[in-house]
């Protein structure tokens, strides 16, 4: 090899790099050395390139032509085929033609950002150049033709289209199976249709932030089964529904901050089982409902700062067993910390909770129950006045506690806090000064002498009358009463909550009077009126009484709205035969749902019940008695009962039975002159009619024959020989006839035979 060629006159050299940037060049330097691998021609005044200038550059791989005045993709002559990276950003290129790129057989990186390109046609990027990274950001692209990038399907890994004017993406716009990063942020996209991104099998990062997306159609991200990160910040989304997330099975991070999302739908997350980080900051959320994120069992970081969350239902975080970081800064969840317990249940792995700037005035004893593993708690930016005894005690792993408040009420109830903080070495991030009493104003709680933490008065309101659990009939008026006392003359405000949410248009009556026992103490009463109650009024009611020193929360009183039961089905009288099945119907409505109970003849211990022949079918309001017996006959009562009262309806069960003998009719032998009785004791329903026969004929009665009124007993007196014969008892009712027979034998009158034996 000959001696190394010198550096070009207008340039500087370092290794195999030639830097001709920022020299005001209008044309290529003529003496480019052949050893050049990297050529920097940026920040010049080049409006066109002479391909001949690149004839003798066999090692050229990297060309920087950014910040010039080129209007088209230049040809680099013979060097085109081995250039790997071509930087053309910040020129005046208006379009890209496939013919301009055909010669770049080795091109892997092409930067066309910050030019004047207005459209991308499917002729722009031909098959050939193995481009891996294509940057078209900061152009004026409004149209993306279907298949515009198909020519790059075998090579393209990163595509940047940010800061353009794209308003719409065609369905299946990209057939780029190797693409891992797609950047579409800062465009004008309004809608993502289903299957828009199908064909991007390898995509890992999709950036759609700062568009105007208001709707994600079902299946919007279908096909992105390898995607890890989705950016949708700064759009106009109002909700995240389940269908739109369908197919995002590998998603790790979802960025949705700075939208207008007002509600989290529980079912929205079932397709994102691997989600680790969910960012919903700067939205319009006002509440977190129970189990609204329960599907996200792998979620590690949840950011909900800068919303308007004022209500966190108990169990709102249920299912988030892997969550480590929960950011709730700048919301309005004071009530959750001041009163509720259980809001954070389910967060077994949480190590960091931030609640900065939530207007929290006090910390309730059980506010953080369920967060025993917490290591970092930020309560800064809250004008905290009081912390209930032992509020943080169960957090054995707490390493950092942030409190910054100059509003502390330094009374006997706060005395525990300074030693506890110091004992746990948590005072480093606690700036806590007293506002009251006046003698301690401005003093750090850590410097206040123990004897100064005294309760000479009760500035914060104290509940003296709690609202009481009550039951009301639909349509009635009811009222809840709540009273509190305070030694402060600070203005008092009243609020009522139903199921932990403030009632905005509550019908309230408030008044104040001086407490009789102590002229210094004011008693404040608030009455909540509920007019013509409906089922919608049911719930747990609580009053919140607030003054400058804090809020006091009453017990929660339950209102149950009742409706007296009324029958929708009543039992009817029935008549049936024995051994068959009796069926009685009974159903009732009411609120709460009434319970149905059955009785027979006023009691619950009856044959069908005892013998397990009674069956109640709760789903179809039917009462059955199987294998009906005569004893089952009677009056059955159906009683429908709820907390409002009870009603009853009766039905008579009549049991029909074919006639039968209770006692068998036996043959008899009597002597002349004696009296004989034949009993035909029959049962049956209706009671059978009994007729006596002698032989085949109805019995002829004489003065010697006597029948009881029901014909069940036949008495024959002074029996004569002619009375002998076959007697038949015939028992008949509407169900049938039964017969029984008795052979009557008559012996001669009693006397002595010649042989000495007795007759009769």
């Amino acid at each position: 090899a000959g001696p190394r060629a010198p550096c070009a006159a207008a340039c500087t050299c370092a290794g195999d790099s030639l830097d001709c940037g920022g020299r005001g060049l209008a044309a290529l330097p003529g003496d480019l050395p052949s050893w050049t691998r990297s050529l920097n021609l940026s920040y010049n005044k080049l409006s066109e390139i002479d391909p001949a200038g690149f004839e003798d550059l066999p090692n050229l791989q990297e060309v920087y032509l950014n910040n010039n005045e080129l209007t088209a993709v230049p040809s680099l002559g013979a060097a085109s085929s081995h250039v790997v990276s071509l930087f053309l950003q910040h020129n005046k290129i208006r379009s890209v033609e496939g013919s301009q790129l055909k010669a770049y057989l080795s091109l892997e990186v092409l930067d066309l950002s910050l030019n004047n390109i207005t459209e991308v046609r499917n002729t722009c990027f031909p098959h050939g150049p193995p481009i891996k990274e294509l940057n078209l950001a900061g152009n004026r692209i409004g149209t993306l033709e279907l298949g515009a990038f198909d020519g790059l399907s075998r090579s393209l890994l990163t595509l940047r289209l940010s800061k353009n004017r794209i308003t719409q993406l065609p369905v299946r716009a990209f057939k780029l199976p190797r693409l891992t990063q797609l950047d579409l942020n800062r465009n004008r996209i309004r809608l993502i249709e289903g299957l828009t991104f199908q064909g991007l099998n390898s995509l890992e990062v999709l950036k759609l932030q700062r568009n105007n997306i208001s709707k994600l159609t079902d299946g919007a991200f279908w096909g992105l089964s390898k995607m890890h990160v989705l950016h949708l910040e700064y759009n106009s989304l109002v909700e995240v529904n389940s269908g739109s997330l369908y197919g995002l099975t590998a998603l790790h991070q979802l960025h949705l901050s700075n939208n207008s999302i007002a509600r989290i739908h529980r079912k929205g997350w079932s397709f994102c089982q691997k989600l680790h980080e969910l960012v919903l900051s700067f939205n319009n959320l006002t509440r977190l409902d129970e189990e609204s994120l329960a599907e996200l069992s792998s979620l590690s970081v949840l950011r909900l700062s800068h919303n308007s969350i004022s209500h966190i239902a108990e169990g709102a975080f249920k299912g988030l067993r892997s969550l480590r970081v929960l950011d709730l800064d700048h919301n309005e969840i004071s009530g959750t910390i001041e009163d509720t317990s259980g809001a954070f249940s389910g967060l077994d792995s949480l190590s960091k909770l931030t609640l900065f700037g939530n207007k929290i005035k006090s910390v309730a004893k059980r506010a953080f129950s369920g967060l025993e593993g917490l290591e970092h708690l930020n309560l800064g930016g809250n004008a905290i006045r009081s912390v209930q005894f032992d509020a943080f005690v169960k957090m054995k792993n707490l390493k950092e506690l942030h409190i910054s408040s100059d509003s502390f009420l330094c009374d006997c109830q706060l005395k525990w806090l300074p030693p506890w903080l110091i004992g746990r070495m948590l005072q480093a991030f606690v700036t806590a000064t007293c506002a009251h009493p006046e003698s301690l104003k401005g003093q750090s709680i850590f410097s206040v002498p123990p004897e100064s933490f005294v309760c000479d008065d009760f500035l914060k309101p104290q509940i003296i009358t709690q609202p009481e659990t009550t039951m009301a009939m639909v349509g009635k008026d009811i009222r809840f009463t709540c009273s509190a006392a305070s030694s402060s003359s600070s203005p008092m405000t009243f609020a009522w909550k139903k199921d932990n949410e403030v009632l905005t248009n509550a019908d309230m009556e408030n008044f104040v009077h001086v407490h009789a026992q102590d002229g210094e103490v004011m008693e404040y009463t608030t009455i909540l009126h509920l007019r013509q109650v409906t089922f919608g009024h049911e719930g747990r009611y609580q009053c919140v009484i607030t003054n400058h020193f804090g809020s006091t929360y009453s017990h929660k009183a339950r209102l149950t709205v009742n409706v007296l039961p009324s029958f929708t089905k009543t039992p009817h009288d029935i008549t049936i035969r024995t051994t068959t099945m009796a069926r009685l119907e009974c159903a009732a409505t009411g609120h709460p749902n009434p319970q149905i109970a059955w009785q027979k003849d006023g009691g619950t211990d009856f044959p069908a019940a005892r013998e397990r022949r009674m069956h109640v079918m709760p789903d179809d309001d039917v009462f059955f008695i199987t294998d009906v017996k005569i004893d089952d006959a009677g009056v059955y009562s159906c009683t429908a009962q709820n907390s409002a009262g009870s009603i009853s309806a009766n039905a008579t069960l009549t049991v029909l039975e074919t006639p039968s003998l209770v006692v068998p009719l036996e043959d008899r032998v009597v002597s002349v002159g004696e009296t004989v009785a034949l009993q035909c004791k029959a049962t049956g329903n209706p009671p059978p009619r009994i007729t006596w026969f002698k032989g085949d004929r109805p019995l002829s009665l004489t003065e010697r024959h006597h029948l009881t009124p029901d014909n069940q007993l036949l008495v024959v007196q002074n029996v004569v020989a002619e009375d002998a014969g076959r007697y038949t008892c015939e028992m008949s009712n509407t169900l049938g006839t039964e017969r029984a027979h008795s052979q009557l034998s008559v012996l001669p009158a009693a006397g002595c035979r010649k042989d000495g034996t007795t007759v009769g």
Partner: antibody, heavy 117, light 107 residues
Framework: QVQLVQSGAEVKKPGASVKVSCKAS????????LHWVRQAPGQRLEWMGW????????KYNQKFQGRVTITADKSASTAYMELSSLRSEDTAVYFC??????????WGQGTLVTVSS | DIQMTQSPSSVSASIGDRVTITCRAS??????LSWYQQKPGKAPKLLIY???ILHSGVPSRFSGSGSGTDYTLTISSLQPEDFATYFC?????????FGGGTKVEIK
Amino acid sequence: QVQLVQSGAEVKKPGASVKVSCKASGYTFTSYYLHWVRQAPGQRLEWMGWIYPGNVNTKYNQKFQGRVTITADKSASTAYMELSSLRSEDTAVYFCAREELGGFAYWGQGTLVTVSS
Amino acid sequence: DIQMTQSPSSVSASIGDRVTITCRASQDISNYLSWYQQKPGKAPKLLIYYTSILHSGVPSRFSGSGSGTDYTLTISSLQPEDFATYFCQQGNTLPRTFGGGTKVEIK
């Protein structure tokens, strides 16, 4: 670091007054309570009173009420304890101390006051 | 005033010994109990405050326990520099009051 430096030893006659100073450094003088404690020979330590320099509130042990006055000069970060109507049993080492959770975390080196005719 | 009764008034021990000093208050002092070490001609040095919190720079062989009216200072393994007089003091009410002291001497 926190330091409390007291004035030197004093010898006084019965009936006279003594004023002992305590200069604080290494912390915000107006944010902490300063106490005065004395130790007479062979006696247990005896608390005399405190001052909160931030608002110059004071509290005294009733035993010394009327004889002791504690003051502070915020600009000089210095507290003073003046004991009047001295008697021989007031002979003791007088300490200033800064409190933390009811305990005296930082002490001055002590000032011996001898009352003798 | 709350009376503080310290016992024993003196104890003789050897290096490495475990030493326990007790302090009883005449009424509940809500854990506001401090322990001091004092050497002749010096100001007392805070060892423990609020019953069991070790003041910065104090060796971990010193520990405190107790509640209500009864409190204990324990030196787990006596070192040569630990021979001194130890005082307890209640900080719950005014006036602050001190125990009579326990002198720990070399056996």
